[in-house]
Structure formats: C-alpha cells, structure tokens
C-alpha cells in the first residue's frame, strides 16, 4: 500500500483584508490513523492554527466534515483575515499515540494579504 501523502495543491493564496482564506489540504490514505493539525511557519517557533482533535480556534472552520471517519479533506477557512495572518501554512498529519507524533507535512501554502479595497463614492 502506498504511503500517505499530504497534498496542499496551492503554493500561494492571496486574500483581501477582512475576507476569509481557504487553505486546501487532502490526504491520500486513511492510514495511519491520527489527527491533522495546521501550523503557520516552520521550525520551533511554528504557531498552531488548528488542531482537529482538540482546542478552541474561533476563526477557523473546516471546509468538509473532518470528523467523519472516511474524510480525507482537511481544508480550512480562516475568517476576517488581517495582515498579521500572512505567512506559510502547513497541513500536518499526525500518527495516533500517546502522545500523537508527527507523520508527514504538506509542502505549505503561502498566504498573502492584500489591502482592503477602498470604496470611493462619487457625487454628481
């Protein structure tokens, strides 16, 4: 059986401030069993953005029903984007255990934030 791959199809995504950003991630197998986590950045200072298993992430929602056992789509939507959200986001598969251990990471999606479009009212 082929080893699970974590696929982040978009190398980059650009979103206007105040909008929502959709970050796509799918896995190619249900094995090994274990949760998905999303991080911003890499290395020791990487920031946890979403943990499928636990935690409170008020601006993040899953695009599909990620709790369904057969689900292989772990895309997320981040609401009310601000310039502080810019960065590279990684979808990471963990292997179930005590504790769960990192199994494989996606290649990352770079999120850039455009200025909110200004609305000019023209008076005639």
């Amino acid at each position: 059986e082929e080893e699970l791959q974590v696929i982040q199809p978009d190398k980059s995504v650009s979103v206007a401030a105040g909008e929502s950003a959709i970050l796509h991630c799918t896995v190619t197998s249900l094995i090994p069993v274990g949760p998905i986590q999303w991080f911003r950045g890499a290395g020791p200072a990487r920031e946890l953005i979403y943990n499928q298993k636990e935690g409170h992430f008020p601006r993040v929602t899953t695009v599909s029903e990620s709790t369904k056992r057969e689900n292989m789509d772990f895309s997320i939507s981040i609401s009310n984007i601000t310039p502080a959200d810019a960065g590279t986001y990684y979808c990471v598969k963990f292997r179930k255990g005590s504790p769960d251990t990192e199994f494989k990471s996606g290649a990352g999606t770079e999120l850039s934030v455009r200025a909110k479009p200004s609305h000019h009212h023209h008076h005639h």
Epitope: G43, A45, E47, L48, P99, T101
Partner: antibody, heavy 122, light 107 residues
C-alpha cells in the same frame, strides 16, 4: 520527572572536533525540539540551533553554521552536537534545553541539562 | 535577527529593595519572552514565560510585564537567594536571542 543529562567535560586540541550528548528522560523525546545554547566564560547565553527528533529537521543560528552539527538517536532518546575545527573562542559551557513541537509558551526552555564544559587548549 | 537589549548590565541592591530590569526587543515579539535566572556554575532556570506567567515554585515577588518591544522583570522585595544574573529571551522567531544579562549584586 523530566531530566536532560549531558556528557562530561572535554579538553580538546585546536583544530579537533568534539561530540557532546544530551539524554532525555521522563517524557516523550520526539514531541520536543532540542536546542543547544553556548555560554563562554563570564559571558552571556547564545542560541546555537535546534533539532526535531521526529524527522531530524534542524534550524541553526547563522553564526554557528559550519561549526555545530546537530543529530539525534531517537531509540536512545539522545541528542548530539558535534563542534568542528575547534578554536580557543569555542571554549564554553554548552547547554541543551527544549521546547514543544509547536510554539506552546509554557514549554519553552523550562528544562535544561547541567551543561558540558568544552576547553580548547593545546 | 531580533536584538534584545537588556539594562542595566549590573546593579547593586540591598535585601528588601525593589529591583527592576528592562529588556527592549528590536522588533515586535508580542508576548513571547522568557526571564531566566542563573547562579554561578549552574544552568539557567526559567522564572517567567510569555512575558508575565510565573513558573511553578517561583516566588510571587517576581513579576513580568510588557508587550511588543518593551519588557520588565520586577523583584518586589529582594531576598538573599535572588542575587544572580538574569536574562531575557525572545522565542518569537529564529534565531532565538537572549539579552546580555543583568548581574544583581549585594550592596
């Protein structure tokens, strides 16, 4: 109780290399980044780099690239730092310390090894 | 790299004194700052993480405050066991950097 136990003091000749070890016990080794910190005699603390045992991912302070090489042996729950082409300015105490696999505030640099003194002398 | 400028580099104080040590970051690090205490011949010991959260077992006379680029460690009433060197450390981005240290000596 979490413990980081480092190897003993080393006296090495200029130009030689030395490999220091840091053995972790009391918690899951792979869930943490292992960091190394230098303290020259009478000086402050300098971060050298860190390694993530799950996949041996490393990150280095540019200043120590080419000087320090970080490795791990997961089966032995041990991290290693090899220092090469040693010079007198590499004389220092080297500490290992750790942080969680993501940037959980409470897990940054709370546990430290006792330090290993490396003396470079001809 | 983020530079951490700590002041003063040393100070003399008496038991019971209130002591304040400051750390300035060269760019915004949010609240991602630790304060460490080190005694001669020993490994550093973390006192405070995330700017103001006290580690377990650390006396309440130690407190931390600040955010962004300006941070403070305060010892409200200095005790004999507090004479040591104190370092700030930013862990917002790699390479992680320490302040130069503040040596607190007996007056």
């Amino acid at each position: 109780e979490v413990q980081l136990v480092q190897s003993g003091a080393e006296v090495v000749k200029p130009g030689a290399s030395v490999k220091l070890s840091c053995k972790a016990s009391g918690s899951t080794f792979t869930s943490y980044w292992m960091h190394w910190v230098k303290q020259a005699p009478g000086q402050g603390l300098e971060w050298i780099g860190a390694i993530y045992p799950v996949n041996s991912d490393t990150t280095y302070n540019q200043k120590f690239k080419g000087k320090a090489t970080l490795t791990v042996d997961k089966s032995a729950s041990t991290a290693y730092m090899e220092l090469s082409s040693l010079r007198s300015e590499d004389t220092a105490v080297y500490y290992c310390t750790r942080s969680f696999y993501y940037s959980l505030d409470a897990a940054w640099f709370v546990y430290w090894g006792q330090g290993t003194l490396v003396t470079v002398s001809s | 790299d983020i530079q951490m400028t700590q002041s003063p580099s040393s100070l003399s104080a008496s038991v019971g004194d209130r002591v304040t040590i400051t750390c300035r970051a060269s760019q915004d690090i949010g609240s991602r700052l630790n304060w460490l205490q080190q005694k001669p011949g020993k490994a550093p010991k973390r006192l405070i993480y995330a700017t103001s959260s006290l580690d377990s077992g650390v006396p309440s006379r130690f407190s931390g405050s600040g955010s962004g680029t300006e941070f403070t460690l305060t010892i409200s009433s200095l005790q004999p066991e507090d004479f040591a060197t104190y370092y700030c450390l930013q862990y917002a981005s790699s390479p992680f950097t320490f302040g130069g240290g503040t040596k607190v000596e007996i007056k």
